[in-house]
Interface confidence: low
Amino acid sequence: EEELQVIQPEKSVSVTAGESATLNCTVTSLIPVGPIQWFRGAGPGRELIYNLKEGHFPRVTTVLDPTKRNNMDFSIHISNITPADAGTYYCVKFRKGSPDVELKSGAGTELSVRAKPSAPVVSGPTARATPEHTVSFTCESHGFSPRDITLKWFKNGNELSDFQTNVDPAGKSVSYSIRSTARVVLTRRDVHSQVICEVAHVTLQGDPLRGTANLSEAIRVPPTLEVFQRPMRAENQVNVTCQVRKFYPQRLLLTWLENGNVSQTETASTLTENKDGTYNWRSWLLVNTCAHRDGVVLTCQVEHDGQPAVSKSHALEVSAHQKEQCSDTTSGPVLAPTAPLGGSG
């Protein structure tokens, strides 16, 4: 008699999670009499997937009616595949007996499950950096299969090249994770910039997943300071203005010092936003020139976003004409009592 063969024609089958898989198996002879069973894995730890004689296998059906006479097709259909179903499936012929005896196994069909990557999560640096410095962004995505995956980085639509990517684990696994770190050099114009991590995978059908991070979370643009004075209508008053330009983020503390002594402190409130996302602010003092016949130095000191203070000083200029307008008895504070503590505009 011709020796019975168990034929599993496909070496491998690939299915997307949620879909159904068909695993083909035919035998070349009806003899000897005995059942066919399907297993996942080989050896003592193998898992019974389908047994026609007994058991409840709600997700597994036979392609043809296995009870029909002369049937030699024992292919099965597994519905609602999950990544946990991945593995090698064996169609096994048993000889009828008490108990049944394993006679011959097919060569096995490897079922690989295509699983979509999770949405990429992009995380940036924990501390802000200033323009010209390099910051790192990390992108992570998990749970995909097969292992082949493409990850790209973009900054404002332009592809980046300075990044390093790892896919884990290195060996064979049911699913994989990807982690990539990109290095970005900051510029003063990056407040409105965005980095994008784009992941392409066979399961996404050409529609990649994207994760984003705003450089506004990573950048600190330090301010530039300018201090100048302007005369006022009242001949014994001048306006001393501190112009704070092009800073980000908004957090700013300004202190006026008179000859090194603190005269007032204020936090930035009404800011002007520039097109590039940075801010401008100005603070001013009304100075009574009659109180300062001798030279006085006014200093505008700015502490931006918790960083060490920067300052700009201005020597008060009092003209001979202004000095003539002051009676000998005039004295008073640097800040005119009628002026607000600090102006912004």
Epitope: A17, T82, P83, S118, A119, V121, G143, D168, P169, V174
Partner: antibody, heavy 122, light 112 residues
Framework: QVQLQESGPGLVRPSETLSLTCTVS????????WSWIRQPPGKGLEWMGF???????FYNPSLKSRVTISLDMSMNQFSLKMTSVTAADTAVYYC????????????????WGQGTTVTVSS | DIVMTQSPLSLPVTPGEPASISCKSS???????????LDWYLQRPGQSPQLLIY???NRASGVPDRFSGSGSGTDFTLKISRVEAEDVGVYYC?????????FGGGTKVEIK
């Protein structure tokens, strides 16, 4: 049956480094994430971080600068180090196994150690 | 970070009666692969936490079938069909979608 056992000093002085080890018995370190979770007295659970069998680490950003998790495959152990401890780090520290083999990410922290109490005090 | 909010804070129960705990996340835990990345844990008094439910609705090995998890996206519920005395303790939900993994504040279940 996999079992986890934490070990390390029960008392650590402020500003010093806390070091704990978790020994895995009855199973392999392969194909799992190995996690540290803590619970301050009378409070809820806080995930500190975990390490995969290939040495890849993930940390809680709130602790990242102070925490290091490492793996010793030969000893079937993983460890936690936390620098510059304060009284706020007083807690029960648990080591735990996180399943990740199903191919869909993390699907349950299924084995926990019994926890070890660490007090930070001078 | 994803913020997990549980309610109620405390739940007095009668043995044999049903009980229900709610957990809400600050962002969706449902991903394109149709899994909800939410676990439920029970911490009995003086013990370590134990896994009850994973991926939203899957009962862990050895967990009685009176426990069930449901919900999707941002709203999840743990139900105990008939509370038993051994079910007392603090129940925590945890999101496993992304690191840092975050827990809810806990719900203390006690017998009336």
């Amino acid at each position: 049956q996999v079992q986890l056992q934490e070990s390390g000093p029960g008392l650590v002085r402020p500003s010093e480094t806390l070091s704990l080890t978790c020994t895995v018995s009855g199973g392999s370190i392969r194909n799992y994430y190995w996690s540290w979770i803590r619970q301050p007295p009378g409070k809820g659970l806080e995930w500190m971080g975990f390490i995969y069998d290939n040495g890849r680490t993930f940390y809680n950003p709130s602790l990242k600068s102070r925490v290091t998790i490492s793996l010793d495959m030969s000893m079937n152990q993983f460890s936690l180090k936390m620098t510059s401890v304060t009284a706020a780090d007083t807690a029960v520290y648990y080591c735990a196994r996180v399943r990740a083999y199903s191919g869909i990410g993390l699907d349950g922290t299924d084995v926990w150690g019994q926890g070890t109490t660490v007090t930070v005090s001078s | 970070d994803i913020v997990m909010t549980q309610s109620p804070l405390s739940l007095p129960v009668t043995p044999g009666e049903p009980a229900s705990i709610s957990c809400k996340s600050s962002q969706s835990l449902l991903y394109s692969n149709a899994y909800n990345y939410l676990d439920w844990y029970l911490q009995r008094p003086g013990q370590s936490p134990q896994l009850l439910i994973y991926l939203g609705s899957n009962r862990a090995s050895g967990v009685p079938d009176r426990f069930s998890g449901s919900g999707s996206g941002t709203d999840f519920t743990l139900k105990i069909s008939r509370v038993e005395a051994e079910d007392v303790g603090v129940y925590y939900c945890m999101q496993a979608l992304q690191t840092p993994l975050t827990f809810g504040g806990g719900t203390k279940v006690e017998i009336k």
